[in-house]
Interface confidence: low
């Protein structure tokens, strides 16, 4: 494979903790300024597997606020607007990276953490288990 | 609001770049070891708004591999297994944090970046615009 040469302008990495501990610039390069999912689209309401968005806040985490989707129904909404239990509303989950303050309450020291969040819901055909 | 006292064991923060630059431990605390979304569930295939998962790789980003969902159809799959264009398959998007190597190719210096990824698809009732 291609080896990319190390940039000579990199910060010094001779710290005894390297490469576990790295420097991170928190000035976020943000390509999307709309962080409230309720404003970004109304899919959560128009979906055949609609969901509610719950605010999850944790001051020891960055980002401190994460929105979690909870499916409104076990079934899906059919053409008549009724819940059809022959289909299932299920959460679509995504693994995301967050920063966890470590040691706790430190303003400038973090540890990477992977958490699983539900982003929205989709309508699926149920798996039917036939009893022999 | 409540002011949490600073932990006396925090690293020194008298760097001229503070608080923009912080120390991050890359030893991930991972509550979920399954990072391939195709293995985590087969919803992408069973959904009425099925999607394909595309591998997006960037060695200058951490994580370097991100899976992007692309809806297979404009419409949704109906009970007969056909695409119904009276409904729309739409991507559910999520803003996630990634680390971008900065300066480029540096092994131990990053900048936080927010990117929008499509996690999966859901079936929605279209917004119908009636022409006057």
């Amino acid at each position: 494979g291609i080896t990319i040469p190390r940039n000579p302008g990199c910060p010094n990495s001779e710290d005894k903790n390297f490469p576990r501990t790295v420097m991170v610039n928190l000035n976020i390069h943000n390509r999307n300024t709309n962080t409230n999912p309720k404003r970004s689209s109304d899919y959560y309401n128009r979906s055949t597997s609609p969901w509610n968005l719950h605010r999850n806040e944790d001051p020891e985490r960055y980002p401190s606020v994460i929105w979690e989707a909870k499916c409104r129904h076990l079934g899906c909404i059919n053409a008549d607007g009724n819940v059809d239990y022959h289909m299932n509303s299920v959460p679509i989950q995504q693994e995301i990276l967050v920063l966890r303050r470590e040691p706790p309450h430190c303003p400038n020291s973090f540890r990477l953490e992977k958490i699983l969040v539900s982003v929205g819901c989709t309508c699926v055909t149920p798996i039917v288990h036939h009893v022999a | 609001g409540i002011t949490i006292p600073r932990n006396p064991g925090c690293p020194n923060s008298e760097d001229k770049n503070f608080p923009r630059t912080v120390m991050v431990n890359l030893n991930i605390h991972n509550r979920n070891t399954n990072t391939n979304p195709k293995r985590s569930s087969d919803y992408y295939n069973r959904s009425t708004s099925p999607w394909n998962l595309h591998r997006n790789e960037d060695p200058e980003r951490y994580p370097s591999v991100i899976w992007e969902a692309k809806c297979r159809h404009l419409g949704c799959i109906n009970a007969d297994g056909n695409v119904d264009y009276h409904m729309n398959s739409v991507p559910i998007q999520q803003e996630i944090l990634v680390l971008r190597r900065e300066p480029p190719h540096c092994p131990n210096s990053f900048r936080l970046e927010k990117i929008l990824v499509s996690v999966g698809c859901t079936c929605v009732t279209p917004i119908v615009h009636h022409v006057a």
Partner: antibody, heavy 118, light 110 residues
Framework: EVQLLESGGGLVQPGGSLRLSCAAS????????MSWVRQAPGKGLEWVSA????????YYADSVKGRFTISRDNSKNTLYLQMNSLRAEDTAVYYC???????????WGQGTMVTVSS | NFMLTQPHSVSESPGKTVTISCTRS????????VQWYQQRPGSAPTIVIF?????PSGVPDRFSGSIDSSSNSASLTISRLKTEDEADYYC?????????FGGGTKLTVL
């Protein structure tokens, strides 16, 4: 009725800059990804750039990467294309288009002409 | 990146049927939708087929689209040709980061 009206075209010297705008009406602008497509005189269509409904994701053709920037202001129902370091080969009619989904331009504006010449 | 190849021109008489082909150079055509756009002289393009074979409302059923996975190609068929069908036709497809148009086919209705 979906309406897309491009503006901002004109004559510019090589190396110069221009900002195109596309005013949208007749639909919920923030719900749709948008694209710019261009057509050089007597030539075929060439995709230039695309942006997601929220503005969070942007995509560019290799031929314009690093020189052009697509953006949108959903509060003004307006799509933009900032074009820097313009070259003679950027001369074309620039169309803005509303995407049905990624890669499907459902509705088009009438276009605005950009001429890069000394 | 991939390319979409179309014939430069085709011609046919009114009332007849004409087919325009579009071949994808790399990557499975079946994995991504193919669209067809009509562009009359001096006008902006309009979509006549999306999602391989779907017609937007207002497009006559004389227009149809299909794909052939074995040859990695798509086709636009126009039956019962009319003089107003004379135009340039562009196929278009995409992958996860690029949108590509074919070079265009000039249809002449004799």
């Amino acid at each position: 009725e979906v309406q897309l009206l491009e503006s901002g075209g004109g004559l510019v010297q090589p190396g110069g800059s221009l900002r195109l705008s596309c005013a949208a009406s007749g639909f919920t602008f923030s719900s749709y990804a948008m694209s710019w497509v261009r057509q050089a005189p007597g030539k075929g269509l060439e995709w230039v750039s695309a942006i997601s409904g929220s503005g969070g994701s942007t995509y560019y053709a290799d031929s314009v990467k690093g020189r052009f920037t697509i953006s949108r202001d959903n509060s003004k129902n307006t799509l933009y294309l900032q074009m820097n370091s313009l070259r003679a080969e950027d001369t074309a009619v620039y169309y803005c288009a509303r995407d049905l989904i990624w890669g499907v331009a459902g509705s088009w504006g009438q276009g605005t002409m950009v001429t890069v010449s000394s | 990146n991939f390319m979409l190849t179309q014939p430069h021109s085709v011609s046919e008489s009114p009332g007849k049927t004409v087919t325009i082909s579009c071949t994808r150079s790399s990557g499975s055509l079946a994995n991504y939708y193919v669209q067809w756009y009509q562009q009359r002289p001096g006008s902006a393009p309009t979509i006549v087929i999306f999602a391989n074979n779907q017609r937007p409302s207002g497009v006559p059923d004389r227009f149809s689209g299909s794909i052939d996975s074995s040859s990695n190609s798509a086709s636009l068929t126009i039956s019962r040709l009319k003089t107003e069908d004379e135009a340039d036709y562009y196929c278009q497809s995409y992958n996860h980061k690029d949108i590509v148009f074919g070079g265009g086919t000039k249809l002449t209705v004799l």
